[in-house]
Interface confidence: low
């Protein structure tokens, strides 16, 4: 081995040293303060005056380009002159109710001019009026037990569905395909308000007036509606707005609970199917449609003015140039657009890719550049459908596919304060284990342990005893276009609640005027530990990444997910012994394929053992066979009806988008196989999805093969 | 080299409304990517932004004067105009069209001004 | 809006001398800053940019200083031909974009 070797792995430790001790809370805490002081909504003024703060910004902490990337995309925005509401209405057509037009601005924020009403982004116009039908949280199975258990048809109804369980996107686009005219969404007590805590300002709950905008898209991976697979720069072809991807058909709006108390206390039709269809507000929860007794004839309305406009939107790339690798890029983003103050999302998040920039520009100043180019990245539109980040990435997925090592993604760093959350890849759970093992626990009761010891405890793995839990890589997130389209190994980490003990959707005040700078100060994170934990993890895998001489990625834990995926979707199969018997479906052939990945791995790893590190050739070889394994399991042609979603391990659920899906070609062609027209036809997309993942899973193993 | 020049009546009446352009010669708007923007100039209330406009049709105004303000911008013969409707004798100022420093870099300092033209609200 | 407070108002200074002109925000604007100069009939020109760096054409005796909420225009050795109104401006919170009052300096 070479002698030089223990020398380069002392300042490799001693540098990550520097870069970690250099991270200070009080600087996110500073930085969370100025990025929070007005509204950052896509597509504003506002949000420009940051991109350009952080542009001057980086380059004064060190950076060798920054750079504006603009886009013109897609957005939609409230009429200002013409608000959206929904009103009761009887039967002469008078309005007897209205919803609020606007939430209460929170203490010290009165005078703050540009928050943007509650909206459902990307909702069309339309004024729907007609019968209520309450959906539950409006998912698949909903649906199903309405339509097929209960009997009860939404074809022309206005219906309304509590947030929460899956992406609102995926609600919206279940109830269109249920028939319905309009849709309204709520905060549900049940879902946002958490049990002996106060409302904002005084705790960190939902108040009654509080509501959750958001975008209600379904894109899948597309980015801008109206440019998808291309950058939304000024040579693109744009389709006409009846072709654009993704859009939703019907109205939509959301409201907060003390309106939905209004439309949901008279409603009529039956008793909710079962206790999980009860929220928390003092209504019957009966299911419509329509209104009951004396209320019968009157009809809710919706009046709906919003508008889409292609509008310019502003990335912020900071390049910090690699002294040895430079045609390697290890890239940390997180986007900037927030739908009003942004307090957590994403703000809790910019903030420590701002210290992290900070730190990493400190070193270079001081002569210690990375071993690979780190690419920083300030997003835009991530609220309208992660198009920053996709507009980016078409636009330099040649670079990005040949010379993409790795994304982490730097959304909030909080959504609680109770454990670590980490979703990844397979090639970076032993990278998260080991660094996680190195940094010391924020958690009281943990002083002197490591964050591995306390999120191991308070988050332990389903599946390996002593181990903590890693979640497979859904969507919803800037991470998207990178894993699920280019294959590029991705990563993201934050604070969590207590899933056991609290169970509310996302954090109470999620996309709220009420998610504010002193929501984090006073109830999340007063000392700002929780955010440096994160930004020591989000750091440390940027750092290793960026640094290690052999890349820490570990192929045998893809084999073992692997192995454990084919097993999961072998037993889902399974529950139809007959139809696998009579089309003779056989999962054979993926287990074999799997088998010998595992074979192969083994054997690379052993290899990688031997690798002498100071032959430049060898090591890149071997760090090439790694950086391109995330690549191997991207197929060109995309799932069926999701082109966008490439990758045959892993994509978003089809039923809910913030979800991941393991061999996701294959559980989509066996989702509600039993209730298809055509057996034969459906059996035989089974086989033909088995097939893919194992020609993938083959082929993956393959590059893992000594090259010559 | 890059020059603006402004023009548009001296004199306007209280209640109707003021039209001024700028012609920007020696530099295309499309292709310069430079952002152009108005400032008023009065002895009481000093210099003050009005508004900037970009090539896209992206518009930046002044909140004091967005709703009487438009920004408009043909880029085939190189001008820009600005409109402000019901003036008072409070827009009685001297106008200027600026041009906001380097390529991309947005709303920043004002490089390049024009010469400036009086306009008096009387009737 | 960030209000932007220049003193003092009025400085008399003989040629030669050093001129210190200073410009308060109310809020901080990093290094966003800008400084104008404007004679009498004429339209305003720029001196400075990102708080200290000249414009182009701009003499090395005028420099530029400060960061945050303090800011300072300097002329090293005055001349008479820098008898004009000067300007601070802030690009940082907008909108709208602010200036100063001004600081007329006038040459003895």
């Known amino acids: 081995k070479p002698s030089n070797e223990a020398t380069g792995n002392v300042s490799h430790s001693g540098m990550k040293k520097e870069f970690l001790h250099e991270l200070k809370a009080e600087n996110i805490k500073k930085f969370l303060y100025n990025f929070t002081r007005t509204p950052h909504l896509a597509g504003t003024q506002n949000n420009f005056e940051l991109a350009k703060q952080i542009h001057d910004q980086w380059k004064e902490f060190g950076l060798d380009l920054v750079e504006l990337s603009h886009y013109d995309v897609l957005l939609s925005y409230p009429n200002k002159t013409h608000p959206n509401y929904i009103s009761i209405i009887n039967e002469d057509g008078n309005e007897i109710f209205k919803t609020s037009l606007s939430e209460q601005p929170p203490p010290g924020y009165e005078n703050i001019s540009d928050v943007v009403p509650p909206y459902s982004a990307f909702s069309p116009q339309g004024t729907p009026e007609g019968d209520l039908v309450y959906v539950n949280y409006a998912r698949t199975e909903d649906f199903f037990k309405l339509e097929r258990e209960m009997k009860i048809s939404c074809s022309g109804k206005i219906v309304i569905a509590r947030y929460g369980k899956v992406f609102r996107g995926n609600m919206v686009k279940n109830a269109q395909l249920a028939g319905a005219k309009g849709m309204i969404l709520y905060s549900d007590p049940a879902d946002y308000f958490v049990p002996a805590v106060k409302s904002y300002p005084d705790g960190w709950n939902l108040p009654g007036g509080g509501v959750q905008r958001g975008n209600v898209l379904n894109l899948n991976g597309a980015g801008d509606p109206l440019t998808p697979g291309y950058p939304a720069n000024e040579h693109a072809y744009r389709h006409e707005l009846t072709n654009a991807v993704g859009l939703p058909s019907i109205p939509v709006h959301p409201i907060g609970y003390d309106d939905a108390q209004k439309l949901l206390e008279h409603m009529g039709g039956p008793a909710p199917p079962d206790s999980s269809w009860k929220g928390g507000l003092k209504v019957p929860y009966n299911v419509g449609p329509g209104f009951a007794g004396n209320f019968s004839t009157q009809k809710v309305k919706m009046h709906i003015h919003s508008y889409t406009k292609v509008t310019r939107i502003y990335n912020v790339i900071g390049t910090l140039k690699g002294a040895l690798e430079p045609d390697r890029y290890v890239i940390l983003g997180g986007h900037r657009d927030a739908w009003v103050f942004g307090g957590i999302d994403p703000q809790s998040g910019a903030a420590v890719v701002h210290e992290i920039v900070r730190s990493f520009g400190t070193l270079k100043k001081k002569g210690r550049r990375p071993r690979r180019t780190i690419l920083f990245a300030s997003w835009d539109a991530e609220e309208f459908g992660l198009l920053g980040s996709t507009e980016w990435a078409e636009e330099h997925s040649r670079l990005l596919q040949e010379r993409g090592v790795a994304y982490i993604n730097a959304d909030s760093s909080i959504e609680g304060n109770y454990t670590l959350r980490v979703d990844c890849t397979p090639l970076m759970y032993s990278l998260v284990y080991n660094l996680t093992k190195e940094l010391q626990s924020p958690d009281e009761g943990f002083e002197g342990k490591s964050l591995y010891d306390s999120w191991k405890e308070k988050s332990p793995s389903p599946e390996f005893i002593g181990m903590p839990r890693i979640s497979k890589l859904g969507s919803g997130n800037d991470f998207e276009v990178f894993f699920q389209r280019l294959g590029i190994a991705s990563g993201r980490a934050r604070y969590t609640k207590n899933w056991k003990t609290n169970k509310v959707s996302s954090y109470p005040l999620y996309h709220s005027v009420y998610e504010t700078y002193e929501l984090v100060v006073k109830f999340y994170d007063p000392t700002f530990k929780y955010h440096l934990t994160v930004a020591q993890v989000r750091g440390a895998m940027v750092f290793e990444l960026a640094n290690s001489i052999v890349l820490p990625f570990d192929c045998q834990s893809y084999a073992v997910a692997l192995k454990k995926y084919a097993d999961t979707i072998y037993n889902i199969s399974m529950k139809h012994p007959q139809e696998m018997k009579a089309y003779m479906i056989s999962f054979d052939s993926l287990f074999s394929a799997v088998n010998n990945f595992t074979d192969v791995a083994s054997k690379f790893n052993q290899r990688l053992q031997e690798l002498d590190k100071s032959n430049p050739i060898l090591l890149r070889i071997m760090n090439d066979q790694l950086m391109y394994l995330e690549r191997a399991f991207i197929d060109p042609l995309g799932l069926p009806g999701r082109p966008f979603y490439r990758h045959i391990i892993y994509a978003p659920s089809s039923h809910n988008k913030y979800a991941g899906e393991s061999f996701p070609g294959i559980y989509d062609a066996l989702f509600d196989i039993s209730s298809k027209v055509n057996a034969s036809k459906a059996w035989n997309e089974v086989k033909r999805q088995i097939s893919i993942a194992t020609f993938t899973v083959q082929a993956a193993a393959e590059t893992l093969r000594e090259v010559a | 080299q890059v020059q603006l020049q402004e023009s548009g009546p001296g004199l306007v009446k209280p209640s109707e409304t003021l039209s001024l352009t700028c012609t920007v010669s020696?530099?295309?708007?499309?292709?310069?990517?430079?952002?152009w923007g108005w400032i008023r100039q009065t002895p009481g209330r000093g210099l003050e932004w009005i508004g900037t406009m970009f090539y896209t049709g992206a518009t930046y105004y002044s909140p004091s004067l967005k709703r009487r303000l438009t920004l408009n911008m043909d880029t085939s013969k190189q001008e820009f105009t600005l409109r402000l409707t019901s003036v008072t004798a409070a827009d009685s100022a001297v106008y200027y069209c600026v041009r906001h420093r380097g390529p991309d870099s947005g709303l920043d300092a004002f490089d390049l001004w024009g010469h400036g033209t009086q306009v008096t609200v009387s009737s | 809006d960030v209000v932007m407070t220049q003193s003092p108002a009025t400085l008399s200074l003989s040629p030669g001398e050093r001129a210190t002109l200073s410009c308060t925000v109310s809020?901080?604007?990093?290094?966003?800053l800008a400084w104008y100069q404007q004679k009498p009939g004429q339209a305003p020109r720029l001196l400075i940019y990102?708080?200290?760096t000249r414009a182009t054409g701009i003499p090395a005796r005028f420099s530029g200083s400060g960061s945050g909420t303090e800011f300072t225009l300097t002329i090293s050795s005055l001349q008479s031909e820098d008898s004009a109104v000067y300007y601070c401006?802030?690009?940082?919170?907008?909108?709208?974009?602010?200036f100063g009052g001004g600081t007329k300096l006038e040459i003895k």
């Open positions: 990102g708080a200290s």
């Open positions: 401006q802030q690009y940082n919170h907008w909108p709208p974009l602010t």
């Open positions: 809020q901080s604007v990093s290094s966003y």
């Open positions: 020696g530099a295309s708007f499309s292709s310069s990517g430079y952002y």
